[in-house]
């Protein structure tokens, strides 16, 4: 959402979020690190191209032309400088001048040593308990953001991990149309459209960066879960990793796992949609998870096959009209899981990413809640690894990522909601090792892959 320094009456009224970096001679004297040439405070560039007609409520949602409903001036950083005040480096760069390259390695969770697994689990738990040092979240829409008295900004602190959950919730929530009116649900700024992969890529990159800073460990990387095993068991659901099944309640996590102590945020949908409030930092019930346990839907009781990944990587067009969840021959819709692994759209199909979520059969299978289950992180790093392999194979061909007429939030140049500072889909449509400072240690199955009997 927004930096703590910008959650003030003055900043919100002025529309300017350009915090100081090192103000030597008082507030406002080093906006965006301007005194050291790192950046400048400039007008926000927001995509104004038309979106598809399925969203008919222009003017009613704070996420439109993001982030202009809140701020119209922000830091534009020079060179490899980055961040809300140009005080950090772009992903993949380090040093005082952000001129030295770094590359971190995302590895299979199951390949980590005992110590590394333990470190990852502890780090996630620390992120759940540690207040985000930079961002605060809005608990009201823009028209009520200054509170009943017009002088009390409606923002809250939130933990690093819950911020990760909140940003996802905010991107998928319904459009509130007023008290007594049904909220509009045919909107999603991070799924069912071309931005699905780029949005989730930045989402993970932000969490990874936040955890690196929390740990003071620049090499810290998010591992992945290779969910394409074709099995009906969750191989990472053990107490040394993401938590086994509780013996007392098959929908809960074992008390031997730290994740059994986690409590979810953003579960009060009824309130948000009827009162027009937003999810806040209040934690609620436990994570629910029942892998392969949805007996009413046998098709989601088994994970994707290894060859499903090989097949989806042969779909050469990034996306196809109508750039939605019914696109055929679209790599994005295939990996998202609304098409079968060959790219053919079928309304009954749930494959790859979607199937992995639904297989978890609980918190991780509900869009507005799913990041509350930390398996979400590992599921999406694997999805991102598939995306990165596609970018490598097809030379990051962005030509079929639409500039306009995609679902709202999904145009190529749209600033991804609700990330700060503003970041477009285009910026994430690049090969990660060369442009974003991370790589995957992974072997891709070939088409002929078969499981020996």
């Amino acid at each position: 959402q927004f930096p703590r320094q910008c959650a003030t009456v003055e900043a919100l009224r002025s529309g300017m979020c350009c915090p100081d970096l090192s103000p030597v001679s008082g507030p406002g004297t080093d906006r965006c690190g301007s005194s050291s040439g790192r950046g400048r405070c400039e007008a926000v560039t927001a995509d104004s191209r038309p979106h598809s007609p399925q969203y008919p409520h222009d003017g009613r949602d704070d996420r439109e032309v993001w982030p202009l409903r809140f701020f119209n001036r922000t830091c534009h950083c020079n060179g490899n400088f980055s961040g809300h005040n140009c005080g950090t480096c772009r992903p993949g760069w380090r040093g005082a001048a952000c001129d030295q390259r770094v590359l971190i390695v995302r590895r299979n969770l199951l390949d980590l040593s005992k110590e590394e697994k333990n470190h990852f689990v502890r780090a996630l738990d620390m992120a759940k308990r540690t207040t985000h040092p930079l961002f605060v979240i809005a608990t009201r829409r823009s028209e009520e953001i200054l509170g009943p008295d017009g002088n009390t900004p409606q923002f809250e602190n939130i933990s690093i991990y819950n911020y990760f959950v909140w940003t996802h919730y905010y991107s998928v929530k319904k459009t509130f149309l007023g008290v007594g009116q049904e909220s509009f649900g045919e909107v999603d700024f991070s799924h069912e459209g071309p931005a699905f992969l780029t949005w989730h890529r930045y989402h993970l990159l932000r969490l990874e960066k936040d955890m690196q800073e929390m740990l003071q460990e620049p090499s810290f990387s998010l591992p992945y879960w290779n969910f394409a095993t074709g099995k009906n068991v969750c191989d990472i659901c053990t107490d040394d990793l993401m938590g086994s099944r509780s013996n007392f309640d098959s929908t809960l996590i074992s008390p031997n796992s730290v994740f059994s102590q986690w409590r979810v945020v953003c579960d009060s949908l009824e309130d948000y949609d009827t009162l027009g409030t937003l999810c806040n930092s209040t934690e609620d019930g436990p994570i629910r998870r029942n892998p392969a346990g949805n007996v009413a839907r046998p098709m989601v009781q088994r994970l994707p096959e290894p060859q499903d990944v090989a097949q989806c990587l042969e779909v050469g067009l990034f996306d196809t009209p109508p750039f939605y969840s019914n696109s055929t021959n679209s790599f994005r819709n295939t990996v998202e899981g609304y098409s079968d692994p060959t790219g053919k759209y079928d309304p009954a199909v749930r494959s790859l990413h979607n199937l992995a979520h639904l297989f978890l059969n609980g918190t991780g299978g509900q869009t507005h809640l799913s990041p509350n289950d930390p398996i979400f992180v590992l599921l999406h790093t694997f999805t991102d690894a598939v995306f990165d392999e596609w970018l490598r194979r097809y030379n990051a061909d962005i030509s079929t990522f639409p500039l306009e007429n995609a679902p709202i939030g999904h145009n190529r140049q749209y600033n991804m909601v609700p990330f700060w500072p503003p970041v477009t889909n285009t910026e994430m449509f690049v090969t990660a090792p060369d442009n974003l400072g991370y790589t995957y240690e992974i072997q891709w199955p070939s088409r002929e892959f078969s499981v020996p009997e």
């Epitope: 950090t88 480096c89 380090r94 040093g95 005082a96 030295q100 390259r101 770094v102 590359l103 470190h119 620390m126 540690t130 207040t131 690196q212 800073e213 929390m214 740990l215 003071q216 460990e217 620049p218 090499s219 810290f220």
Partner: antibody
Framework: EVQLQQSGAELVRPGALVKLSCKTS????????LHWVRQRPDQGLEWIGW????????VYDPKFQGTASLTADTSSNTVYLQLSGLTSEDTAVYFC??????????????WGQGASVIVFS | AIQMSQSPASLSASVGETVTITCRAS??????LAWYQQKQGKSPHLLVY???TLADGVPSRFSGSGSGTQYSLKISSLQTEDSGNYYC?????????FGSGTKLEIK
């Protein structure tokens, strides 16, 4: 002027527990990570772990996990290292030191004078 | 965990000479490296951070270099006060291990 003032020498029995303090001045400990380092007699430096006094988060080298415990009192700008289950192997000088919160800067820039712990039977 | 191999374990040189101490990391540490000097009975003292940036007040005869897994500390025009132990430390991944140290003696 930045200073880290450590508590005095400790003579302790095997199996006992000791708590060393490090009182800082000249900076706000909430803005820095405080690290601890061990040096056995005529040996090199061993990194123990860090504490972020702003939120109490701690990280330890796995070999010190369970025996070392770091805490902080921001009201008095003091950090503590507690060592339990002491053996003769823990006879050493223990240093507190600080690192800039900006994790990009790779350095422990100011150090305490060290506190000697002698485990004797 | 990253291991830091420091060499030589000890060396002896005369005033005015140049010496080089090296540290090899077991993996790429991307310049997340510091060098410290420790005199007998004293606390370590920061010389170099980010592999090559001299800390405030450190004489220019000290210089750090290197990248990837190989790093060096060079001391030119040796002075008598340069005797002591020298340590490297990485900050790339936890735990932040030190090199085993180099004892420098001035003849």
């Amino acid at each position: 002027e930045v200073q880290l003032q450590q508590s005095g020498a400790e003579l302790v029995r095997p199996g006992a527990l000791v708590k060393l303090s490090c009182k800082t001045s000249g900076f706000n400990i909430k803005d820095y990570f405080l690290h601890w380092v061990r040096q056995r007699p005529d040996q090199g430096l061993e990194w123990i772990g860090w504490i972020n006094p702003d939120n109490g988060n701690t990280v330890y080298d796995p070999k010190f996990q369970g025996t070392a415990s770091l805490t902080a009192d921001t009201s008095s700008n003091t950090v503590y290292l507690q060592l339990s289950g002491l053996t003769s192997e823990d006879t050493a000088v223990y240093f507190c030191t600080r690192r800039d919160y900006t994790y990009e800067k790779a350095a422990l820039d100011y150090w305490g004078q060290g506190a000697s712990v002698i485990v004797f039977s | 965990a990253i291991q830091m191999s420091q060499s030589p374990a000890s060396l002896s040189a005369s005033v005015g000479e140049t010496v080089t101490i090296t540290c090899r990391a077991s993996g790429n540490i991307y310049n997340y490296l510091a060098w410290y000097q420790q005199k007998q009975g004293k606390s370590p003292h920061l010389l170099v951070y980010d592999a090559k940036t001299l800390a405030d007040g450190v004489p220019s005869r000290f210089s750090g270099s290197g990248s990837g897994t190989q790093y060096s500390l060079k001391i030119s025009s040796l002075q008598t006060e340069d005797s002591g132990n020298y340590y490297c430390q990485h900050f790339w991944s936890l735990p932040f291990t030190f090199g085993s140290g180099t004892k420098l003696e001035i003849k």
